[in-house]
């Protein structure tokens, strides 16, 4: 399907002008290639009428132009002095006319209505309010004032100053007669309907001396605003319906094939399940305006959307609406990233979040989508640091791998962590994305002690077991803080027989603190990664207490909760020379220990190859 998008139907009146905007993916090639507007003939060929290279057909000379806006990925065709002959089928497109990078546009030019002389024209959108002004002479001031609607050759009374109101206008019309000296009365009609369209007659007095004024009321369906967004990206519908409906329930709905409108979300708490986890309704401002954000755009999200106000929270005739036509461009600049990430209870997930690579300095945010009411997304962590204290020691946002992607790591998972999370920045809002975390059956792959008590001044070793499948990954220990996880210097012992024959051996990476200080208290993470892509992590809290007995010690079951099936190592700690270690108290060492089996038996499901849109707890 062509990625070019524009208005399907354009209508106007003879003598008027139209402006047609067409959208295209703003790639370098597209920005500089030829843009055209052509008319489809009976033969199927499309004859160029105007192009970005300066060509204008004789039929369009002096009344049309085409302007390219490469920075927006749009071009605009303006046509003036329209005639009935301009009605027809057109294409706006890129490149050569026959190539298919185009969008079909139907233009209909109709004859303007023949109106009596002196007719005042009122053009108003459906659902809005019109005020019809009716002048009269002084002698008709005390006489009856009335508004009639002309239907064919007859006139039907709509309202008069004797308190008559036509049932079709009940509760939405009023006639105002000003104080003395003002020779004009007004009729105000609220919540205009399409059926209100037509010619009206104001009348004051009767007989030959009466005052009359014609008014042509044109009630329009709102012209849908074209919205062009990238697949997997985000769209914001900003809905401003006016103060008159500030206190009325609001909704966003999508027009279906039956031309009715299905509620997507409303302020009464209704939400379409197809948008679960990826839609938020921002509460209204004082002026009654509100906005709806949808992330993770799919091709099937395309269509016509209406926002409106009504006490039922759904579309009703005669209430104000705003319209959009959404096109989802499949030639997306937003990279594919997993929409579902799976982790096991006690384990971890590493979530990749895309952002606009042109905005590397932007603040990065990660929030938890809450569906209650209209939805909120409380901030959990950002690039400046942790925000929610209840995630202390188990949540971190990393700028890596960079160049359009950041990483969020959440460990010590529980079933409560299942849900939808949003990746945001303070920059380009179209790059907001949603990820769902699912907690599945299984065991964490990395095993660390449950908690550790270290003795001031002594040596502390904390083991972290990893299965063979991580033997090729980089292992690390880091100290968690609310601004990140500072990697501790590590010493690589190099390959060994056990490394090569990993199927027979489990492996261990140890953190050594020597000597333990008060500042060492806190959370430590053991993790695996491949380059800048993070995999699983496991967290352990180290408490520091006063020295009771002398001597160095290894973490043993007496002072630490051993990981399941963990073999306890002898208490001797091998000395390693402090060569090229920034902080001589901190280093991580890898030890090979006897195989305890691949303890990831139950967690193989954390990588589900059934969907390219899913990732497990470990990055590939």
């Amino acid at each position: 399907k062509s990625p070019v998008f524009g208005p399907q139907e354009v209508s106007s009146v003879e003598g008027n002008s139209v402006s047609i905007k067409c959208y295209y993916p703003p790639t370098s090639v597209n920005r500089h290639t030829r843009k055209y507007w052509c008319r489809k003939g009976a033969s199927g060929r499309c004859i160029t009428l105007v192009s970005s290279e300066g060509y204008v057909s004789s039929n369009y000379a002096g009344r049309a132009n085409l302007t390219n806006f490469p920075e927006n990925g749009t071009f605009v065709v303006n046509i003036a002095q329209l005639s009935r002959d301009d009605s027809g089928h057109y294409k706006c497109g890129l490149g050569i006319n026959s190539r298919g990078l185009s969008f079909d546009v139907s233009l209909e030019v109709s004859q303007g209505p023949e109106l009596p002389n002196g007719t005042e024209v009122y053009t108003v959108d459906v659902g809005r309010t019109v005020t019809i002004k009716c002048p009269f002479k002084t002698e008709n001031a005390p006489k009856t004032k009335a508004l009639y609607k002309k239907i064919g050759q007859t006139s039907v009374l709509v309202i008069d100053s004797r308190n008559y109101v036509n049932p079709n206008y009940k509760d939405r019309i009023r006639l105002r007669i000003p104080g003395t000296g003002q020779l004009i009365f007004t009729v105000v009609i609220d919540r205009l309907r399409l059926s209100d369209h037509g010619l009206y007659l104001c009348q004051a007095g009767d007989g030959s001396n009466r005052d009359e004024k014609n008014a042509d009321l044109q009630v329009l369906e709102p012209e849908p605003e074209l919205v062009y967004e990238d697949l997997r990206g985000s769209v914001t519908f900003h809905c401003a319906l006016g103060l008159e409906v500030a206190n009325v329930a609001k909704f966003l709905c999508r027009v279906n094939s039956r031309e009715t409108c299905d509620v997507v979300i409303n302020t009464l708490g209704k939400r379409d399940s197809a948008f679960e986890g990826r839609i938020l309704l921002n509460p209204q401002d004082k002026d009654g305006s509100f906005s709806v954000v949808i992330t993770g755009l799919r091709k099937e999200d395309e269509g016509r959307y209406l926002c409106g106000a009504h006490s039922d929270g759904q579309l009703q005739e005669g209430w104000p609406i705003q319209a959009w036509q959404l096109f989802v461009n499949e030639e997306s600049t937003i990279p594919r990233s997993p929409t579902v990430v799976k982790g096991v209870a006690g384990g971890s997930v590493a979530v990749l979040c895309p952002y606009n690579p042109k905005e590397s300095q932007s603040l990065k945010y990660w929030c938890l989508w809450e569906g209650a009411q209209n939805g909120r997304c409380p901030l959990l962590v950002e690039s400046q640091g942790l925000v929610q204290e209840q995630y202390e020691g188990r949540l971190s946002l990393l700028q890596e791998p960079g160049n359009g992607t950041f990483t969020v790591i959440l460990n010590q998972l529980t079933t409560q962590d299942a849900g939808f999370y949003w990746c945001l920045t303070n920059g380009d809002t179209r790059w907001r994305t949603t990820v769902e975390i699912k907690i599945i059956e299984g065991e964490p792959n990395l095993k660390v002690p449950g908690n550790v008590t270290a003795v001031l001044g002594e040596t502390l070793n904390i083991p972290c077991h990893f299965p063979c499948k991580f033997s090729s990954y980089e292992k690390y220990w880091c100290k968690w803080s609310n601004t990140g996880c500072q990697t501790l210097p590590s010493q690589d012992e190099g390959p060994s027989e056990a490394f090569v024959n990993c199927d027979e051996n489990s492996r261990l990476v140890s953190l050594t603190l020597n000597p333990v200080t008060r500042a060492d208290e806190g959370w430590y993470w053991c993790g695996v990664k491949q380059g800048h892509f993070y995999g699983e992590t496991a967290a352990v809290y180290v408490a520091v207490e006063e020295k009771k007995v002398a001597g160095s010690r290894y973490v043993s079951p007496a002072k630490a909760d051993a990981a399941p099936d963990e073999k306890v190592l002898d208490s001797g700690v091998r000395e390693i020379e402090n060569k090229a270690i920034q902080d001589p108290r901190l280093f991580a060492e890898e030890k090979v220990v006897a195989d305890t089996g691949d303890q990831a038996g139950g967690s193989r499901a954390s990588v589900d190859s059934s969907s390219s849109e899913e990732q497990g707890g470990s990055s590939k």
Partner: nanobody, 131 residues
């Protein structure tokens, strides 16, 4: 709710220093930004400085950059404004303000310099700089 109490204001000479404190109590776990604003008689309230409660990133108005320093002590739930090289133009009522972490998408757009971004305010402390 978060309650804020400012202290440290007073009358000083131009060129002198002053340190303002703002003690937060209540639901301090929800704090996101803490800021200082000032309002001179007949003037609009204006941004002075702000600090990110978790990460410690700081923001300053151009008029005070290099002279004022904002800092925090999370353990004491207190934010400080160290004001050096004071000028008569710094005379104003100084207000401490606190902002909750964003929850609604519109909250994410608000900058630490915007008055509308803050949810809680102190009563203010008067700083007078005489020439």
């Amino acid at each position: 709710q978060v309650q804020l109490v400012e202290s440290g204001g007073g009358l000083v000479q131009a060129g002198d220093s002053l340190r303002l404190s703002c003690a937060a109590s209540g639901r301090t776990s929800s704090l996101y930004n803490m800021g200082w604003f000032r309002q001179a008689p007949g003037q609009e309230r204006e941004f002075v400085a702000a600090i990110h409660w978790g990460g410690g990133r700081t923001y300053y108005a151009d008029s005070v950059k290099g002279r004022f320093t904002i800092s925090r002590d999370n353990a004491k739930n207190t934010v400080y404004l160290q004001m050096n090289s004071l000028e008569p133009g710094d005379t104003a009522n100084y207000y401490c303000a606190a902002r909750r972490a964003p929850e609604l998408l519109d909250d994410y757009k608000q900058k630490p310099e915007e008055i509308g971004a803050y949810h809680y305010w102190g009563q203010g402390t008067q700083v007078t700089v005489s020439s």
